[in-house]
Interface confidence: low
Amino acid sequence: VPPGEDSKDVAAPHRQPLTSSERIDKQIRYILDGISALRKETCNKSNMCESSKEALAENNLNLPKMAEKDGCFQSGFNEETCLVKIITGLLEFEVYLEYLQNRFESSEEQARAVQMSTKVLIQFLQKKAKNLDAITTPDPTTNASLLTKLQAQNQWLQDMTTHLILRSFKEFLQSSLRALRQM
C-alpha cells in the first residue's frame, strides 16, 4: 500500500483496474484534475504564475517535453515511438513529483494522489507498450542528488521550481492525452 493511503482506498480492492484506452484516458484526466488544484494553491501563494523570469529558471530544470521527433504530434505521428516517449517522460517526472511532496500545505493529500496516480498510469502504459527495451529508467543515484539539489534551493527558487514542474507536467500530460487518443 503506497504511503499516505489507506489499503481500502487504493483501487478499493474490489474495483479492478482496467488497462483499456478509456481507463488510461480517465487516469490522465484524474491526474490533471489534481494538478489543477495544486496549481491553484501555488498561484495563490506566490506570484510565480505571472513571473517573467520563468525561462531562466526553466533552463536549470531538465523537465521532459514533447518534441517533433517523439512522434506524438499529429504530423509525423508514430505510435510506438510516442508511447516510449510518454513512459520515459513520466518516469523522468517521478523525481520532480517526489520533490512536490513537501511543497504543499492545504493540498498535501492532492500532491500524494498525483504522485501515486502517476505511478499507476506508468504501469498501465507499460502494459500497453510492446517495445519495453527502448524505455530508459532514470538512474536512482542521479535522481537522489537532483532531489537534494532542488531541496537546497532558496525559497524563491523552490516556489519557481514548483510552479514550473506543475506547468510542465500539465503540458506533458495534455500532449500525452491527445496522442494516446490517436492510438
Partner: antibody, heavy 123, light 104 residues
Framework: QVQLVESGGGLVQPGGSLRLSCAAS????????MTWVRQAPGKGLEWVSS????????AYADSVKGRFTISRDNAKNTLYLQMNKLKSEDTAVYYC????????????????WGQGTQVTVSS | DIVMTQTPSSLSASLGDRVTITCQAS??????LSWYQQKPGQTPKLLIY???RLQTGVPARFSGSGSGTSFTLTISGLEAEDLATYYC?????????FGSGTRL
Amino acid sequence: QVQLVESGGGLVQPGGSLRLSCAASGFTFSNYYMTWVRQAPGKGLEWVSSIYSFSGDTAYADSVKGRFTISRDNAKNTLYLQMNKLKSEDTAVYYCTRDLGGVVVTANGYDYWGQGTQVTVSS
Amino acid sequence: DIVMTQTPSSLSASLGDRVTITCQASQSISTELSWYQQKPGQTPKLLIYGASRLQTGVPARFSGSGSGTSFTLTISGLEAEDLATYYCLQDYSWPYSFGSGTRL
C-alpha cells in the same frame, strides 16, 4: 467502513431553497468524485450533479442547471447541494453517492450510496 | 446528450429462469456502463461496472456484457431475492444518464 449520511431535506414551497449535506467517512474523501442522484416518488433514478475530486469542476443535469449548485469541503469531508428556485418536480429522495476515484482510477460506478434525504416541494 | 433506452420496462419470470435486460445507448459509450439493483424500500446497489465487471459480493449469477451502444444484464438462475428494479447508467460523458428501469 465507508459511510455517506445525507441531511437537510424537508418540505419547502415552490420557489424556495434548501441545502443538502452529505457527510462522508471511511475513505479519503478528497480523492473521489462525488455525485447526487435523485428518485421521484414511484419513478426511476435520475443523475443530478457530479463534482471532481480536486479542482471542484462540476456538471449538472439539464433539469437542474442554473438552479442547483454542487460543492464540496474536502477539509470537512462533506458534499453539498444548494437547491434554489425549487419546483414541484424536484420532489424526490436525494442520494449522495461516491463516484470514481482513489489512486487507481477504475471503471465508474457508484459503489456507495447514502440512505437518502426526502425533499418535498409543495404549497 | 446520451439517451439510454432500457428494455423491457417490466418482466415476469419464474425462479431458476435466465433473465436478460438490455440497455441501448444513443451513441457509443465504450464500456462506460454500470448496472444497479434496487429492492423495494432500499437504496440502489451497484452490481456491474465497466459493462462486465462484477462488484464484490454480488452473486456470480449476475453478468454484464456489451460495448459501444448495446449492453445486456443477465441473471442466470433467478432467485427470489432478485425481485427488484434494475437500472443501467452511462458514465461515459456528462450529463450522465440512467435507463428508465426494468421491474422484475
